[in-house]
Amino acid sequence: MGARRLRVRSQRSRDSSVPTQCNQTECFDPLVRNCVSCELFHTPDTGHTSSLEPGTALQPQEGS
């Protein structure tokens, strides 16, 4: 199918959203149960909705 297997990762069960270890440029996506490429998360000072572009701040205030 042409897809390259980039690294070994544990496949999680359909009902699992337990993160596996991802490299620095990736994060765990519970939807697809795999590490995926991730952009920097932005968090506004208020902790509410922001019109800042994604990636303008680095630190999240709380986990998802």
């Epitope: 199918m1 897809a3 390259r4 297997r5 980039l6 690294r7 990762r9 496949q11 359909r14 009902d15 959203s17 993160p19 991802c22 994060c27 765990f28 996506d29 519970p30 939807l31 697809v32 149960r33 795999n34 995926v36 490429s37 991730c38 952009e39 920097l40 998360f41 932005h42 509410h48 909705t49 994604p54 990636g55 999240p60 709380e62 986990g63 998802s64």
Partner: antibody, heavy 125, light 107 residues
Framework: EVQLVESGGGLVQPGGSLRLSCAAS????????IHWVRQAPGKGLEWVAW????????DYADSVKGRFTISADTSKNTAYLQMNSLRAEDTAVYYC??????????????????WGQGTLVTVSS | DIQMTQSPSSLSASVGDRVTITCRAS??????VAWYQQKPGKAPKLLIY???FLYSGVPSRFSGSGSGTDFTLTISSLQPEDFATYYC?????????FGQGTKVEIK
């Protein structure tokens, strides 16, 4: 510029087959998950399948499992949806979409940020 | 599967009105909810991700809130271009399910 372009839709008889293509540009599909979402005439959105081209994993909605196959060719930067044993209820506009992820404490926070224009699949005798 | 129930299914409003659409998940989805806008004959557009974060380029009159099972999309002052159908979607687990949609019509 990120773009997704679907093709391959058309009129097919019940029991027939079609292969939809989703050609991506402006990003590499191996970095994201690619999803197919459909919308029957006058109805809401229904997720169909996803593929993570970088690792080759897939999953399907129960309504299409065993009949549809999602795949990707990273060398062509294109995702595919092979649709077999088509039924009248599969009639819909089919969209491909990219899921974007933002890193929130190591976990993806995101949504489907880029969508194709859609391709109409009509299953009728 | 996680069911996403949107209400109302349709509403009539005027330009300048404050509009609120709610979405209830059948089980806890944390903040893994996105909101989309769709106009007839067009593909959906991402408005909000992770329940409360505005996607790049989306006007600040749109906002999202909620966690767990109850979520809200608010348009603070409805504009003519906002008349459309809005969908919530959970992305905590496969299958990523959508709400049935809320059509915002002109009063």
């Amino acid at each position: 510029e990120v773009q997704l372009v679907e093709s391959g839709g058309g009129l097919v008889q019940p029991g027939g087959s079609l292969r939809l293509s989703c050609a991506a540009s402006g990003f590499t599909i191996s970095s994201n998950s690619i999803h197919w979402v459909r919308q029957a005439p006058g109805k809401g959105l229904e997720w169909v399948a996803w593929v993570t081209p970088g690792v080759g994993s897939t999953d399907y909605a129960d309504s299409v499992k065993g009949r549809f196959t999602i795949s990707a060719d990273t060398s062509k930067n294109t995702a595919y949806l092979q649709m077999n044993s088509l039924r009248a209820e599969d009639t819909a506009v089919y969209y491909c979409a990219r899921r974007v992820c933002y890193n929130r404490l190591g976990v993806c926070a995101g949504g489907m940020d880029y969508w194709g224009q859609g391709t109409l699949v009509t299953v009728s005798s | 599967d996680i069911q996403m129930t949107q209400s109302p299914s349709s509403l009539s409003a005027s330009v300048g009105d404050r509009v609120t659409i709610t979405c209830r998940a059948s089980q806890d989805v944390s903040t893994a909810v996105a909101w989309y806008q769709q106009k007839p004959g067009k593909a959906p557009k991402l408005l909000i991700y992770s329940a409360s974060f505005l996607y790049s380029g989306v006007p600040s009159r749109f906002s999202g809130s909620g966690s767990g099972t109850d979520f809200t999309l608010t348009i603070s002052s409805l504009q003519p271009e906002d008349f459309a159908t809005y969908y919530c979607q959970q992305s905590l687990m496969t299958p990523p399910t959508f709400g049935q949609g809320t059509k915002v019509e002109i009063k």
